[in-house]
């Protein structure tokens, strides 16, 4: 807290300019009018204030706007945004995507801070849903943003927004998140033809059910092993050897290198060894010839 002292003669700030870098904290407090600061916030970002000086400027704005800053000030905060606490940000009503972009730019290249997370939360809640433009903006700054949302939060993403999602945006998503996103992606891309559809849907397939994988196997899609390894184990297990062969196309040879890893390992255990042998890859661990396969899950359901 800066002590209240009178502004020395001749030091009253008539505008926000670089001469203020020479002011002490108490001089900024005494000589800079808060209303002047608010109307010339766009200049602050171009002036090399110290963090100590920024503390004073923030304090002046806090006094002027105890209920929270207006958007006209927020959009010009620049690096003063780094001084804001999540509690400060919760008082804001940010509706403009341009304001959001301006503040995200300040934090660019850094991890998502609690301030940024609060800002995004306030913005998205204010909009009611994660629309395409917002998602475009957020994933441009934070490729992992989508995967930081809970399945419940993801449920508010409209299918139209899925067009903004890039493969790298889904890199850190877990199966529960992909379970929510996949049906939206399927809906978003439903009018595309086979090969184009597969290119778009590929990143979301970690949430695909067995029947969709079976359908894809009929379309000569040549899924790569990296995508196959991200599929839900429970969706892969019911696939036949023939279906997997069609699904992977020339990439089927990669199964050998992955035979000890899920879901390939678990899938091999469910296949007849005879069928696996038809691939000519030397995959071992299938059900030996003459053994009866009981579907215990079906038996439990009947009892």
């Amino acid at each position: 807290e800066v002590e209240k002292t009178a502004c020395p003669s001749g030091k009253k700030a008539r505008e926000i300019d670089e001469s203020l870098i020479f002011y002490k904290k108490w001089e900024l407090e005494a000589c800079v009018d808060a209303a002047l600061l608010a109307t010339q916030m766009d200049r602050v970002n171009a002036i090399p204030f110290t963090y100590e000086q920024l503390d004073v400027l923030k304090h002046k704005l806090d006094e002027l706007y105890p209920q929270g800053y207006p958007e006209s000030v927020i959009q010009h905060l620049g690096y003063l945004f780094l001084k804001m606490s999540p509690e400060d940000i919760r008082k804001w009503n940010v509706t403009s995507l341009e304001t959001l972009k301006a503040l995200l730019e300040v934090n660019k290249g850094h991890e998502m801070s609690p301030q940024v997370a609060t800002l995004i939360d306030r913005f998205v809640k204010g909009r009611g849903q994660l629309d395409k433009d917002t998602l475009d903006t957020l994933t441009a700054f934070y490729p992992g943003y989508l995967c930081s949302l809970s399945p419940e939060e993801l449920s508010s993403v409209p299918p139209s927004s899925i067009w903004a999602v890039r493969p790298q945006d889904l890199d850190t998503c877990d199966p529960r998140q992909l379970d929510v996103l996949y049906p939206k992606a399927r809906l978003a891309f439903q009018n595309m033809n086979g090969s184009e559809y597969f290119v778009k849907i590929q990143s979301f397939l970690g949430g695909a059910p067995t029947e969709d994988l079976k359908a894809l196997s009929q379309q000569n899609v040549s899924m790569d092993l990296a995508t196959f390894m991200k599929l839900r184990t429970d969706a892969v297990l019911p696939l036949t050897v023939a279906e997997v062969q069609k699904l992977l196309g020339p990439h089927v040879e990669g199964l050998k290198a992955e035979e000890r890893h899920r879901p390939v390992r678990d899938w091999i255990l469910r296949q007849r060894q005879d069928d696996l042998d038809t691939l000519g890859l030397g995959l071992q661990g299938g059900i030996p010839n003459g053994y009866l396969v009981l579907d215990l899950s079906m038996q439990e359901a009947l009892s």
């Epitope: 020395p8 030091k11 670089e18 001469s19 020479f22 002490k24 108490w26 090399p48 110290t50 100590e52």
Partner: antibody, heavy 121, light 107 residues
């Protein structure tokens, strides 16, 4: 280790302009952490602050000298300079350049060795 | 402009003595005060800033205190290399101003 070195004529005629340059070595004048200043000390008298400059070119002068003084910076040469116009014998002094860390309770932490300037015809 | 007045203007002391120098500001300057040491023909050297913070590399026998208008520089046990002139300087507001010095001489 940052060092400062003043240079310029040791003798200036009355009514002319005194020009001095301070060369910064061992560090960059373009650091956002420092101001750079000039201070003088007339023989047997008190130290007097002349002014400060930031690498961006923004400057701040002693009101008693403001009408006659100009401090400038040349980041490409890692130098800052002092010009004092219309000099009189009262401007005879040892002139020091110094570094001032940016902070609320700052003080000149590194000084040049000083250069004696005599104003005389 | 803030005036800085030092006292005494000079003093004589012996090695091992405790020496106290005072500096008074013409108005309150909180703790925006620095102390410098200058030996004949040499450059001023920063000893203390923010009234009581010892500059890196300065011996701990030097200490500063005070706030507002009255400040003190103390040398707890005077050493031969401490005979010099000491200046205070306020950085509360520009123009920065210096005291006119206290010369510490050998008794």
């Amino acid at each position: 280790q940052v060092q400062l070195q003043e240079s310029g004529p040791g003798l200036v005629k009355p009514s002319e302009t005194l020009s001095l340059t301070c060369t910064v070595s061992g560090g960059s004048i373009s650091s956002s952490s420092y101001f750079w200043g000039w201070i003088r000390q007339p023989p047997g008298k008190c130290l007097e602050w002349i002014g400060n400059i930031y690498y961006s070119g923004s400057s701040n002068y002693n009101p008693s000298l403001k009408s006659r003084v100009t401090i400038s910076v040349d980041t490409s040469k890692n130098q800052f300079s002092l010009k004092l116009s219309s000099v009189t014998a009262a401007d005879t002094a040892v002139y020091y350049c110094a570094r001032l860390p940016r902070g609320d309770r700052d003080a000149f932490d590194i000084w040049g060795q000083g250069t004696m300037v005599t104003v005389s015809s | 402009e803030i005036q800085m007045t030092q006292s005494p203007s000079s003093l004589s002391a012996s090695v091992g003595d405790r020496v106290t120098i005072t500096c008074r500001a013409s108005q309150g300057i909180s703790n925006y005060l620095a102390w410098y040491q200058q030996k004949p023909g040499k450059v001023p050297k920063l000893l203390i800033y923010a009234a009581s913070t010892l500059q890196s590399g300065v011996p701990s026998r030097f200490s500063g205190s005070g706030s507002g208008t009255d400040f003190t520089l103390t040398i707890s046990s005077l050493q031969p290399e401490d005979f010099a002139t000491y200046y205070c300087q306020q950085s509360y507001s520009t123009p920065f101003t210096f005291g006119c010095g206290t010369k510490v001489e050998i008794k």
